[in-house]
């Protein structure tokens, strides 16, 4: 007859995964709190410090590639200009336009202006007196 095996003392044994510490834990299991709070965006400024782009909708993927000759002779910073006002940043759907436009079309808005009819091309100090 085998001797009875004494019951092990378990009072100092910790669960491997610390389950006793987590005894009172209530898993969220999907308990999601949605806060429907209106954000005050009235003081948000665009990178250029203007509100020009306030109605801008990011294309989130629509890229427009336009094949146009580019006149770089009068390139200025995007900030402080309206040059970028119609830009749609994007990333995926690609629309390729093979539109042939010459340099005249690029500078069409300047043709006939006082600056255009007084200053020679590439002329230095431009000043309307």
């Amino acid at each position: 007859q085998t001797a009875p095996v004494p019951m092990p003392d378990l009072k100092n044994v910790k669960s491997k995964i610390g389950s006793t510490e987590n005894l009172k834990h209530q898993p969220g299991g999907g308990k999601v709190q949605i806060i429907n709070k209106k954000l005050d965006l009235s003081n948000v400024q665009s990178k250029c410090g203007s509100k020009d782009n306030i109605k801008h909708v990011p294309g989130g993927g629509s890229v427009q590639i336009v094949y146009k000759p580019v006149d770089l002779s009068k390139v200025t910073s995007k900030c402080g200009s309206l040059g970028n006002i119609h830009h749609k940043p994007g990333g995926g759907q690609v629309e390729v336009k093979s539109e042939k436009l010459d340099f005249k079309d690029r500078v069409q808005s300047k043709i006939g202006s006082l600056d255009n009819i007084t200053h020679v091309p590439g002329g230095g100090n431009k000043k309307i007196e």
Partner: antibody
Framework: QVQLQQPGTELVKPGASVKLSCKAS????????MHWVKQRPGQGLEWIGN????????NYNEKFKSKATLTVDKSSSTAYMQLSSLTSEDSAVYYC?????WGQGTTLTVSS | ENVLTQSPAIMSASPGEKVTMTCSAS?????MHWFQQESSTSPKLWIY???KLASGVPGRFSGSGSGNSYSLTISSMEAEDVATYYC?????????FGGGTKLEIK
């Protein structure tokens, strides 16, 4: 200050040629187109042509192509307009202009 | 050639009266410029780039228009405004002037 100096009057005979001058001062001469304009007595203004003083490039009103020749002398900042085969129809005031500034005009009289 | 037609050719206005003159182009232009010429003097640039006043031009003058139809307006006529006004285009060669509007005072 910007000035465009033109001789007041020129009297020439029919069939002859004349070279009108326009001396510019007070600004960088080669930076600006020089235009020439004709005005007959009691009439309106007619654009003759212009010249780029940097390289001598010219544009002419077709009407004046065989009549006027535009040139410049960069060293003296002077623009010239030569008029050939003169007739009474060429009697007029001729202005050189930078558009924002105008010369006083040269009164050309073609008479025998 | 882009023909500029000004109307009326001659007009007169009383002091304080509003004055409008027009310039019609046979082809569209990007900008219209206006010159004032008082009798027996050289023309002066008066309005440039359609609506900008040249240096020293009184604020009662204004310019407007687009395409092939442009106008110069004086909000309240003054005696010193008596002159001939010419429109001018530089949008295509040859550059051209209108025939002028002679403004007189009543």
């Amino acid at each position: 200050q910007v000035q465009l100096q033109q001789p007041g009057t020129e009297l020439v005979k029919p069939g002859a040629s004349v070279k009108l001058s326009c001396k510019a001062s007070g600004y960088p001469f080669t930076n600006y187109w020089m235009h020439w304009v004709k005005q007959r007595p009691g009439q309106g203004l007619e654009w003759i042509g212009n010249i780029n003083p940097t390289n001598g490039d010219t544009n002419y009103n077709e009407k004046f192509k065989s009549k006027a020749t535009l040139t410049v002398d960069k060293s003296s900042s002077t623009a010239y307009m030569q008029l050939s085969s003169l007739t009474s129809e060429d009697s007029a005031v001729y202005y050189c202009t930078r558009v924002t500034y105008w010369g006083q005009g040269t009164t050309l009289t073609v008479s025998s | 050639e882009n023909v500029l037609t000004q109307s009326p050719a001659i007009m007169s206005a009383s002091p304080g009266e509003k004055v409008t003159m027009t310039c019609s182009a046979s082809s569209n232009v990007n900008y219209m410029h206006w010159f004032q010429q008082e009798s027996s003097t050289s023309p002066k640039l008066w309005i440039y780039d359609t609506s900008k006043l040249a240096s020293g031009v009184p604020g009662r003058f204004s310019g407007s228009g687009s395409g092939n139809s442009y106008s110069l307006t004086i909000s309240s006529m003054e005696a010193e405004d008596v002159a001939t006004y010419y429109c001018f285009q530089g949008s295509g060669y040859p550059y051209t002037f209108g025939g002028g509007t002679k403004l007189e005072i009543k």
